[in-house]
C-alpha cells in the first residue's frame, strides 16, 4: 500500500486575460491544504485564443462564443472532471475594453454581457467578467511577480529560486507593457506618494506595503504606434509618410479611418486631403526615438517629479521585473540578458532598425510580417519609455530584469488577480507548519 499513489488533493483556477490585441486563458493549480502558503500556486496551462481582443467584436458580438470555445474546451481537458464545478473562472478585461468604454459604456457592457453568457455555459464556477482598472492591473502584476519570487515569504532561504533573486525581502517593482496601456508599480524608498490616485496600501503576510502605481492608457505599444503615426502624418506633405521606425524598403498602406478609430489619436486628428497614406520605412533608430519622445509631454509637472503627461513618479527604487510585451519584444531582439548594458541595447537597436526589410524577412521567415515589421518601433519605444518616460539611466538599467516566466508561471496580472479573488493572500502571516515550504525544494 505504501507505493499506492494517494489522490491528489489539489485545486484549480482559471483566469482569462482579455487584452487589447488578444485573449489568453491561464490555468492555475495548488495543493488544497496549503492555500495560504506563499509560492504554492503555479500555472499549468496557457491557451492563447485565436483572433483579436474582445473589444474588436463590438459589431459582431454573436461571434464571441465561438471565439472562446477552443481555449475553454482545453480547460475542460486539463482540469479533471471531478474538479470542474469547484474551479472558479474569472475574466478580466484591460485597456482595449477601457478604450471601448470611453467611447460607449453600453458597447463595452454588451461585449461583456455576451462574454459572461458564453462562459456561463461551461461546467466551471464562473465568477464574472469585468473591466479591471489600470491601478488593479498594476497592483496585481506587482503581487504576481513578488509572490512567484517568494518575496512575501518570511522564511530566509539559503538557496535561490530564480536566477535574479537577491535572496532578500526587498520587493521587485513591476513594469508591464500591453498593447493599449503600460503600468509601472513599485515600493518607493521613504517617499511620500504625492498623488493619492497613485497610492496603494497592502498588508500581505503580516507586512505593510506602500505601493506606487500608474497605468498610462494609450501608451501600450500598439496604441503608441497609432499615436505616433497620427502625429507624424499631420506634417507629411503628401500621402507618403517616410517613417524612421520601420525598416528601409518596408511599405504599408494605412487607411486614415483606421488611424482615427481609437480615442488615443483624438488629440492629433485633422482632415487630411487623402483617405489613405503609405508608410515607407527609412530605418533610423535615432530619428524614431526622437519621434516617439514627442508623445511624452514632459513640459508640465505639478509634483516634485513626474514621468510624463503631468503624472507623478517617485524616484525609482530597487530591482524591476519587466514583463508582457517588454519581455516578448526584447526576447525577440535577443536583448533580455542580464549582461547587456543599456548602451549595448541602443547599439543593437540602431543596427536592427537599419537592416533592410527584405533582409529582415529572410532572416525571420517564420514570423508573421505584421509583427515582424513592428519590432523596430516596439524596441525603440521600450527604450524611450524606460529611459525618458520612467527615468531609468544607463546605471539603473541593470536593475531591470526582462521576465517571461518565474517558476513556470507567466509574469502578468492574472495570477495576482486570482490570488486576491480566492483570498489566497492572507493579511497576516499564517502559522507555520513543518515542511510547509517543501514545495520550493
Amino acid at each position: 500500500t505504501q507505493n499506492k499513489a494517494l489522490p491528489e488533493n489539489v485545486k484549480y483556477g482559471i483566469v482569462l486575460d482579455a487584452g487589447s490585441s488578444h485573449t489568453s486563458l491561464y490555468i492555475y493549480k495548488w495543493p488544497a491544504e496549503k492555500e495560504n502558503d506563499t509560492g504554492v500556486v503555479h500555472q499549468v496551462e496557457e491557451c492563447r485564443v485565436k483572433g483579436p481582443g474582445i473589444s474588436k467584436f463590438v459589431q459582431k458580438v454573436n461571434e464571441i462564443g465561438i471565439y472562446l470555445t477552443d481555449c475553454m474546451e482545453r480547460a475542460r481537458e486539463v482540469i479533471p472532471r471531478s474538479q470542474h464545478q469547484e474551479t472558479p473562472v474569472y475574466l478580466g478585461a484591460t485597456a482595449g475594453m477601457r478604450l471601448l468604454r470611453m467611447e460607449s459604456e453600453e458597447l463595452a457592457d454588451r461585449v461583456l454581457d455576451v462574454v459572461e453568457r458564453s462562459l456561463s455555459n461551461y461546467p466551471f464556477d464562473f465568477q464574472g467578467a469585468r473591466i479591471i482598472t489600470g491601478q488593479e492591473e498594476g497592483a496585481y502584476g506587482w503581487i504576481t511577480i513578488n509572490y512567484l519570487l517568494g518575496k512575501f515569504s518570511q522564511k530566509t532561504r539559503w538557496f535561490s529560486i530564480v536566477p535574479y533573486e537577491t535572496n532578500n525581502q526587498e520587493t521587485f517593482g513591476a513594469l508591464d507593457l500591453g498593447g493599449a496601456s503600460t503600468q509601472v508599480t513599485f515600493v518607493p524608498q521613504n517617499q511620500t506618494i504625492e498623488s493619492p490616485d497613485n497610492a496603494l496600501q497592502f498588508r500581505l503576510y503580516g507586512k505593510d506595503y506602500n505601493v506606487y502605481t500608474h497605468s498610462f492608457l494609450c501608451y501600450g505599444k500598439d496604441q503608441a504606434l497609432w499615436q505616433k503615426l497620427a502625429k507624424d502624418i499631420q506634417v507629411a506633405s503628401n500621402e507618403i509618410l517616410r517613417d524612421p521606425c520601420f525598416h528601409p524598403g518596408y511599405k504599408k498602406v494605412v487607411n486614415v479611418s483606421d488611424l482615427y478609430k481609437t480615442p488615443c489619436t483624438k488629440r492629433f486628428e485633422m482632415t487630411l486631403p487623402f483617405q489613405q497614406f503609405e508608410i515607407q520605412g527609412i530605418g533610423n533608430y535615432q530619428q524614431c526615438h526622437q519621434s516617439i519622445l514627442e508623445l511624452f509631454n514632459t513640459s508640465y509637472c505639478p509634483y516634485s517629479q513626474c514621468a510624463f503627461n503631468g503624472i507623478f513618479l517617485p524616484p525609482l527604487q530597487g530591482d524591476f521585473g519587466a514583463f508582457s510585451a517588454f519581455y516578448f519584444v526584447m526576447k525577440f531582439l535577443n536583448l533580455t540578458s542580464e549582461k547587456v548594458s543599456q548602451e549595448k541595447v541602443t547599439e543593437m537597436m540602431k543596427k536592427f532598425c537599419a537592416q533592410p526589410w527584405e533582409e529582415i524577412k529572410t532572416s525571420y521567415a517564420g514570423v508573421k510580417e505584421k509583427y515582424l515589421s513592428e519590432y523596430c518601433f516596439s524596441g525603440t519605444y521600450i527604450l524611450s519609455l524606460l529611459l525618458q518616460g520612467y527615468h531609468f539611466t544607463a546605471d539603473s538599467w541593470e536593475h531591470i530584469h526582462f521576465i517571461g516566466k518565474i517558476q513556470g508561471s507567466d509574469a502578468g496580472w492574472t495570477l495576482g488577480y486570482m490570488l486576491n479573488l480566492t483570498n489566497m493572500i492572507p493579511a497576516e502571516q499564517p502559522l507555520s507548519t513543518p515542511l510547509s515550504h517543501s514545495t520550493y525544494v
Epitope: 463590438v58 459589431q59 471601448l100 468604454r101 470611453m102 467611447e103 460607449s104 459604456e105 453600453e106 458597447l107 463595452a108 457592457d109 454588451r110 479611418s257 482615427y260 478609430k261 481609437t262 480615442p263 483624438k266 486628428e269
Partner: antibody, heavy 123, light 106 residues
C-alpha cells in the same frame, strides 16, 4: 453653448436621393458620438443611425439599412446622412442628436438635439 | 429589436398633482433607460438618463426609477409647463423609443 443645426431637407420623389447635414458647435465634436433620429408627422420618435466618437461602432435601424449612410467630418464639426432610394415612409422631421456621457464614458442616449430638417418623399 | 411599451397612452392630471409614467421593455435593458420631454413644435429634451440620473438643468420634481424591464418617470408636483409628450428610450441594444405618453391637463 451646444448647438446642432440640420440642413438639406426638402421635397424629393420616391427612389431619389438626399443628403442631410448637421453643423455642430459649442463642444469638442470628435469626443462625442452622433446620431440621426426622425419623427414622422404626428408620430413618435424613431432612431435612424449612430456613429460613435471614434467610428468603432456605426449602426442603422433595419428600416434604413442598405439605403442610408451616416458619416462625419470631425475637422468640419459636421455629421451627414446620405439617403438613397427614398420611400414615402421616410417622410419625417430628421433630428441630429449628440450622444451623452456617463462621467468619463460615452452613452447611447441623446443629450442635445437640433431643431430638425423636414424631408418629404412624394411624387 | 427591444420593444418599449409606455403606459398609459394619455394621462390627465391637475397642476400640483403627482404624475407617474411607466415604460416596459420587451427584454432586460439593465439601467440603460432614458426619458425625454417633447412639446409641440419643439425638439425633444433629455430629462433622465440611465434610469435615475437627472439631466443638467432639469428641475428636481422629475425623477426616474427602475431597472431590468420596468421603469418609471415621476413628476412630483405638476407645473403648467410640464404638459407635453414623454418618451422613454433604451440603449442596451440599438436605440428604440416608446410610443410616448401624452400628459394633458385634467
Amino acid at each position: 453653448e451646444v448647438q446642432l443645426v440640420e440642413s438639406g431637407g426638402g421635397l424629393v420623389q420616391p427612389g431619389r436621393s438626399l443628403r442631410l447635414s448637421c453643423a455642430a458647435s459649442g463642444f469638442t465634436f470628435n469626443n462625442y458620438g452622433m446620431n440621426w433620429v426622425r419623427q414622422a408627422p404626428g408620430k413618435g420618435l424613431e432612431w435612424v443611425s449612430s456613429f460613435s466618437s471614434s467610428s468603432t461602432y456605426i449602426s442603422y435601424a433595419d428600416t434604413v439599412k442598405g439605403r442610408f449612410t451616416i458619416s462625419r467630418d470631425n475637422a468640419k464639426n459636421s455629421l451627414y446622412l446620405q439617403m438613397n432610394s427614398l420611400r414615402a415612409e421616410d417622410t419625417a422631421l430628421y433630428y441630429c442628436a449628440r450622444h451623452g456621457r456617463y462621467g468619463g464614458y460615452g452613452g447611447f442616449y441623446f443629450d442635445y438635439w437640433g431643431q430638425g430638417t423636414m424631408v418629404t418623399v412624394s411624387s | 429589436e427591444i420593444v418599449m411599451t409606455q403606459s398609459p397612452a394619455t394621462l390627465s392630471v391637475s397642476p400640483g398633482e403627482r404624475a407617474t409614467l411607466s415604460c416596459r421593455a420587451s427584454e432586460g435593458v439593465k439601467s440603460y433607460m432614458h426619458w425625454y420631454q417633447q412639446k409641440p413644435g419643439q425638439a425633444p429634451r433629455l430629462l433622465i438618463y440611465k434610469a435615475s440620473n437627472l439631466a443638467s438643468g432639469i428641475p428636481a420634481r422629475f425623477s426616474g426609477s427602475g431597472s431590468g424591464t420596468e421603469f418609471t418617470l415621476t413628476i412630483s408636483s405638476l407645473q403648467s409647463e410640464d404638459f407635453a409628450v414623454y418618451y422613454c428610450q433604451q440603449s442596451w441594444n440599438d436605440p428604440t423609443f416608446g410610443q410616448g405618453t401624452k400628459l394633458e391637463l385634467k
